[in-house]
Amino acid sequence: PTGAVEVQVPEDPVVALVGTDATLRCSFSPEPGFSLAQLNLIWQLTDTKQLVHSFTEGRDQGSAYANRTALFPDLLAQGNASLRLQRVRVADEGSFTCFVSIRDFGSAAVSLQVAAPYSKPSMTLEPNKDLRPGDTVTITCSSYRGYPEAEVFWQDGQGVPLTGNVTTSQMANEQGLFDVHSVLRVVLGANGTYSCLVRNPVLQQDAHGSVTITGQPMTFPPEA
């Protein structure tokens, strides 16, 4: 409607690393003569409309969200209604709505995408000794405490992708971070390098691990 307060937020999701602080940007255009006494600002979880933080009756009513949110009080009068979310957790991921009411009202939703980098993969081999060409080995690539779920790629020493006989499992811990274990079953050649790449799709961060297997030369029993 004509004259309704226009609330603006970023179109793209805000990406925040677990444990860091995130700013959910929100702004409105104050009319001439605007004072904070006229402002009613509500931040809420979009899906449930659960209150996160509010500014009403001319004052900051504080955080209703685990005491981890704050406004920018010095900037409110200029139309900056952004919300600071401290110590971001996986559970914070989702959509937040900025609802502004002055003479009329308007709202807009901004998405928070949480991310955590994966650790450098550790590689284990089973069996890990007396290996000969032709043996079947299991190579496990493990990377820890990332978010969201990873994409895992295997390749050989020549960079050829290995897609068969790969089993990948991802388990979330109590914080919602994922531990990824990817298992490659491969028949050994004379020598071989096997690499695993663990990619965080949000951060576009790749973590690499590799193992080089030197097979024992083939020995034959002496002829009678």
Epitope: P1, A4, V5, V7, N40, I42, Q44, T46, D47, T48, K49, Q50, L51, T56, S95, T97, F99, S101, I102, R103, D104, F105, G106, S107, A108, A109
Partner: antibody
Amino acid sequence: QVQLVQSGAEVKKPGSSVKVSCKASGGTRPAALINWVRQAPGQGLEWMGGIIPLFGTANYAQKFQGRVTITADESTSTAYMELSSLRSDDTAVYYCARDQVVATSGVNFGMDVWGQGTTVTVSS
Amino acid sequence: DIQMTQEPSLTTSPGGTVTLTCRSSTGAVTTSNYANWVQEKPGQAPRGLIGGTNKRAPGTPARFSGSLIGGKAALTITGVQPEDEAIYFCALWYSNLWVFGGGTKLEIK
């Protein structure tokens, strides 16, 4: 259980105004949005505007801008919708419906409570 | 102006399952549109069934469920009852206003 009780039927002349009331009883929900919705004979539902009584702020549909005024009296838990310059095509049933700005229960039920409707007939 | 499209009419049988949809001219419906579904029967005031895309209002039978399907808001009635014959309106929130769809007349045969 919250109820919305609306004022009675009205018969009005073209060019005049009508003011319909909507009283909430049986408990309140913080920062509710009281919407006004109308339905002309044989037509669908049409949103006219809404008010947040706690804040005293209202919004209007473009179509009704300048012709409708929505107000609220928090002390009596009553919202009002006044429509001016009435025409015959304003003949309709007018409803108030409560939505929530903040869901204290953590569940957003939407426009879960409706008034019984007020019939407004515009005729010369 | 924002236009919303619903199926004008649908027919189903008692015990069957039917899905009503609501498409927006602005693009895909999201959770921030807070899709509402309202049931209207002749001579009665409208009744809010679903709010916030998929939250059943108190008193709404469990056979009614709301969702987003292929960028549209959807109302599914599983195990349709004869008393479900009515007109169903969707409503979507756009920042500062509600917009209603034209309604779907559901016939039970």
